[in-house]
Interface confidence: medium
């Protein structure tokens, strides 16, 4: 079998809401993946599991099942949404994200995604990790790749 390539493209959109009384930020982050099937037979994308970390803490998880079938030598772009919550020990971020005096409230999040594909009863898992900028101060739609955080080191939060 040839490879199945998974490429994390980036954040497509981030929709934010707040709970002032709970000092809580709710971020619905939609991400985009390109999955390429380099085989001469179809493969099934069985599931996508994703999680988002802020400052080494998991703030959101998602799992999509029975997603799609990718034909031979074909590529599909898949969007998946991870609902995240920044609260409690991280409630100090509420003040930053709602600060009116600054226009952009970028925070660095680590996106982790694992794609499970199956073909002829065989299962394969491919994982990716990327740091991304997300604006926690407003609803934002990104050009693909626009939210990339290029520093390969663990960011200081």
């Amino acid at each position: 079998p040839r490879s199945i390539d998974v490429k994390y493209i980036g954040v497509k959109s981030a929709y934010v809401s707040y709970d002032v009384q709970k000092r809580t930020i709710y971020l619905n982050i939609t991400n985009t993946l390109n999955i390429t099937n380099n085989n001469y037979y179809s493969v099934e994308v069985e599931n996508i599991t994703a999680q988002v970390q802020f400052s080494k803490t998991v703030i959101g998880k998602a799992r999509l099942n029975n997603i799609t079938i990718i034909g031979p030598l074909d590529m599909k772009q898949i969007d998946y949404t991870v609902p995240t919550v920044i609260a409690e020990e991280m409630s100090y971020m509420y003040d930053f994200c709602t600060l009116i005096s600054i226009k952009v409230h970028n925070i660095v999040l680590m996106m982790q995604v694992t794609v499970t594909t199956t073909y002829f009863g065989h299962s394969e898992q491919i994982s990716q990790e990327r740091y991304q900028y997300v604006d926690c101060g407003r609803n934002t739609t990104y050009q693909l790749g626009q939210s990339e955080y290029l520093n390969v080191l663990q960011p200081q939060q």
């Epitope: 709970d19 002032v20 009384q21 000092r23 409690e88 020990e89």
Partner: antibody, heavy 121, light 112 residues
Framework: QVQLQQSGAELAKPGASVKLSCKAS????????MHWVKKRPGQGLEWIGY????????KYNQKFKDKATLTADKSSNTAYMQLSSLTYEDSAVYYC??????????????WGTGTTVTVSS | DIVMTQAAPSLPVTPGESVSISCRSS???????????LYWFLQRPGQSPQLLIY???NLASGVPDRFSGSGSGTAFTLRISRVEAEDVGVYYC?????????FGGGTKLEIK
């Protein structure tokens, strides 16, 4: 119906500790935060802090940081507040109150029966 | 900390008349989302406090519509029209915009 049943009155000596309980019934305990409020005779109400029973996360009024310890037992749907190093100023009625509602609409909608703590030598 | 002030410690009132209880905060309780984070509670003699008003002007479930809340960012009023004997007790305002939550000193409503 939704109820918060608090433990009975406590009589304690200065320097001692007491542990007050607040048993929740009629709702899903882990879905709501539990706050504690102090009422001294002839004085107003003071907010002590809260616990999120789901995660165990606590937030305290700085004034009570070294005085009160909030815990919760999910298996018995009970919130606890331990008061340590008691002084006469700790003599008061202590209330637990549930913070209920929905996103951006939270309020103290249910209050416990109150526990009277008397510190006396 | 935000300081909540209730200027009148007690308020004598005749049944059937209207009364206003005032409360001030040392900082605006009006959030940028348009909500004003102020509660009003009533503590009847020998009872636990009960919620009357949340977010400055919203009537809590089961509370008679004789009660109403109003105000600006720092000055608030609880109005009781047609006071009844069961309305006696101590009325507290409380801010829940910022931690620590803070209460006013209370206003005791007494029947003349």
């Amino acid at each position: 119906q939704v109820q918060l049943q608090q433990s009975g009155a406590e009589l304690a000596k200065p320097g001692a500790s007491v542990k007050l309980s607040c048993k929740a019934s009629g709702y899903t305990f882990t879905n709501y935060w539990m706050h504690w409020v102090k009422k001294r005779p002839g004085q107003g109400l003071e907010w002590i802090g809260y616990i999120n029973p789901s995660s165990g996360y606590t937030k305290y009024n700085q004034k009570f940081k070294d005085k009160a310890t909030l815990t919760a037992d999910k298996s018995s749907n009970t919130a606890y507040m331990q008061l340590s190093s008691l002084t006469y100023e700790d003599s008061a009625v202590y209330y637990c109150t549930r913070e209920g509602g929905s996103i951006s609409d939270w309020y103290f909608d249910v209050w416990g029966t109150g526990t009277t703590v008397t510190v006396s030598s | 900390d935000i300081v909540m002030t209730q200027a009148a410690p007690s308020l004598p009132v005749t049944p059937g008349e209207s009364v206003s209880i005032s409360c001030r905060s040392s900082k605006s309780l009006l959030h940028s989302n348009g909500n004003t984070y102020l509660y009003w509670f009533l503590q009847r003699p020998g009872q636990s406090p009960q919620l009357l008003i949340y977010r400055m002007s919203n009537l809590a479930s089961g509370v008679p519509d004789r009660f109403s809340g109003s105000g600006s960012g720092t000055a608030f009023t609880l109005r009781i029209s047609r006071v009844e004997a069961e309305d006696v007790g101590v009325y507290y305002c409380m801010q829940h915009l910022e931690y620590p939550y803070t209460f006013g000193g209370g206003t005791k409503l007494e029947i003349k």
